[in-house]
Amino acid sequence: IPVIEPSVPELVVKPGATVTLRCVGNGSVEWDGPPSPHWTLYSDGSSSILSTNNATFQNTGTYRCTEPGDPLGGSAAIHLYVKDPARPWNVLAQEVVVFEDQDALLPCLLTDPVLEAGVSLVRVRGRPLMRHTNYSFSPWHGFTIHRAKFIQSQDYQCSALMGGRKVMSISIRLKVQKVIPGPPALTLVPAELVRIRGEAAQIVCSASSVDVNFDVFLQHNNTKLAIPQQSDFHNNRYQKVLTLNLDQVDFQHAGNYSCVASNVQGKHSTSMFFRVVESAYLNLSSEQNLIQEVTVGEGLNLKVMVEAYPGLQGFNWTYLGPFSDHQPEPKLANATTKDTYRHTFTLSLPRLKPSEAGRYSFLARNPGGWRALTFELTLRYPPEVSVIWTFINGSGTLLCAASGYPQPNVTWLQCSGHTDRCDEAQVLQVWDDPYPEVLSQEPFHKVTVQSLLTVETLEHNQTYECRAHNSVGSGSWAFIPISAGAHTHPPDEFLFTP
């Protein structure tokens, strides 16, 4: 660590005095101190002499000697006071710039340590400090305003009591800059815009920041627009607004609009798209298939997407039949707006009943006219089966009728013993009927098919079973011949109860 001679922490001299400060180290040494006149520097290897033969108040300050080659970076310091009765202050800088919440050092150095008791900090023209100004004083360094605020950006003077009167320093301008967290915040309204050619439109681009130094502009398809800026200050933020008013839009006004703001922290931008159309439009679509099949008892939501400009003047869901004249309950229909020009309309159909199959139409109207989108809802049913014994053209025939949706497939089984349902161990014979006769097949209704099994002689200790199945489920009917005639057995429990 270098050593300074004289080896005192502070040295007090009068103006005009000769001052010699000598620094000795192991290697070469360097002096650092306030920029002031009349100093002479003489270096000789490991020592360096700083001297003046005419000290002035401007030489007041802390002089530090460092040894650049020292890996520990040690230093020694001495503070020099040049006590001038006419000049109690040596101001090292007339402008101090800090960020908010930093400590701001106003470097007015006292030239006489004796005056420390009577020092104070004031604003220029003798005005008192702002309330809540928290500061401290060091005769070596000056006044420190702790955690400086933007509002404390003022011109200050250091005051010392000399012979009963206050003597002021020259003024120091403090600039407290707001801490800018990032580029300005932006809003571009609306987020999307559609207009018919000839209509009026407005696009508003606004940016705000804690600091006034930022730029904002609105551009259309990369062309910067000439819009007079409107400025404001509220909620402790500076706001700059650009309003684009188009009295009569045309196709060349369409396209991409970007609101761009920048400051020292960087750039922010946000965009919107402006569509200009020739006339009103109304488009209905659905992500769902317009032909829907649902199992009876289950629920279904029908969804329609509407894209329209101008807005809808009316809309409703209508049941077009064929079963009843009931209409969907309004409480089951709801609308959600995705954005200004796109909406989703949903019709909820919970626990569907047979009478609710059919056509459902969504109708919407705007100045562009009426549009409709129709869904066809068919209900799926598991098969219901019945078997009867009859004679056709003199031959004994088992006749199986199965109805359900989708169209059921029919399989005949012959099994030993009397049973409600043939199991694998009992099965003697199986017949698949690939083409049962379709008895009825109307839209939105069940399909009824009929299958015939010609039996020359009914075996009395056997069971004949008709099984029908489709994608929803299966149904069966067991036919048990008895000597006195024939006996039919429906299954123990029906799979479906309408």
Partner: antibody, heavy 118, light 110 residues
């Protein structure tokens, strides 16, 4: 409809000042920059400067810096152009023009003739 | 001395097509759009073409504009006697933060 109506003709002596007004109607006055352009007899168009009616901010052509002052009164949707220390070569027709967003002057005042003569 | 350069005069007979050129620099025409103004004798200038090639409503489609690099041109087809006027080109100049004009071209219909 959108229009700009300027004050009447002026005759001034060299060294004097002239203040020309331009009243806007049919649109939002603060929504567009107002420019001033002059045309000396038999000469072309010469841009003088613009004013932002919103903020009062201005930008003057180098040639007129120090001699021209552009102001506005938003309460009556009027822009003003004052030219001081008039010389004989300031004799011209002075136009105010609305600057449309795409940097074109889409609406012009009818013009104010200023004659500078001793 | 105008910033944009135009020929001082042009002429044509009725029905003919005439073209007026306008040249500038990178700070004006090179980086911004060009506008054309028509000034009939004793009247204020009127916007004729904006954004290089767009016509305001009411301007006949006989008038068309184009731009390439630092030059632009105005074409008038099917020349009519009422087209006799002064034509000015103009463009925003980034270095001035204001518009610059051409010296004007006097069009005579012979």
């Amino acid at each position: 409809q959108v229009q700009l109506v300027q004050s009447g003709a002026e005759v001034k002596k060299p060294g004097a000042s002239v203040k020309v007004s331009c009243k806007a109607s049919g649109y939002t006055f603060t929504g567009y920059y107002m420019h001033w352009v002059r045309q000396a007899p038999g000469q072309g168009l010469e841009w003088m400067g613009w004013i932002n009616p919103n903020s009062g901010g201005t930008n003057y052509a180098q040639k007129f810096q120090g001699r021209v002052t552009m102001t506005r009164d938003t309460s009556i949707s009027t822009a003003y152009m004052e030219l001081s220390r008039l010389r004989s070569d300031d004799t011209a027709v002075y136009y105010c023009a609305r600057l449309y967003y795409y940097y074109n002057m889409d609406v012009w005042g009818q013009g104010t003739t200023v004659t500078v003569s001793s | 001395q105008s910033v944009l350069t135009q020929p001082p005069s042009a002429s044509g007979t009725p029905g003919q097509r005439v073209t007026i050129s306008c040249s500038g620099s990178s700070s004006n025409i090179g980086s911004n759009t060009v506008n054309w103004y028509q000034q009939l004798p004793g009247t204020a200038p009127k916007l004729l073409i904006y954004s290089n090639n767009q016509r305001p409503s009411g301007v006949p489609d006989r008038f068309s504009g184009s731009k390439s690099g630092t030059s632009a041109s105005l074409a008038i087809s099917g020349l009519q006697s009422e087209d006799e006027a002064d034509y000015y080109c103009a463009a925003w100049d980034d270095s001035l933060n204001g518009p610059v004009f051409g010296g004007g071209t006097k069009l005579t219909v012979l």
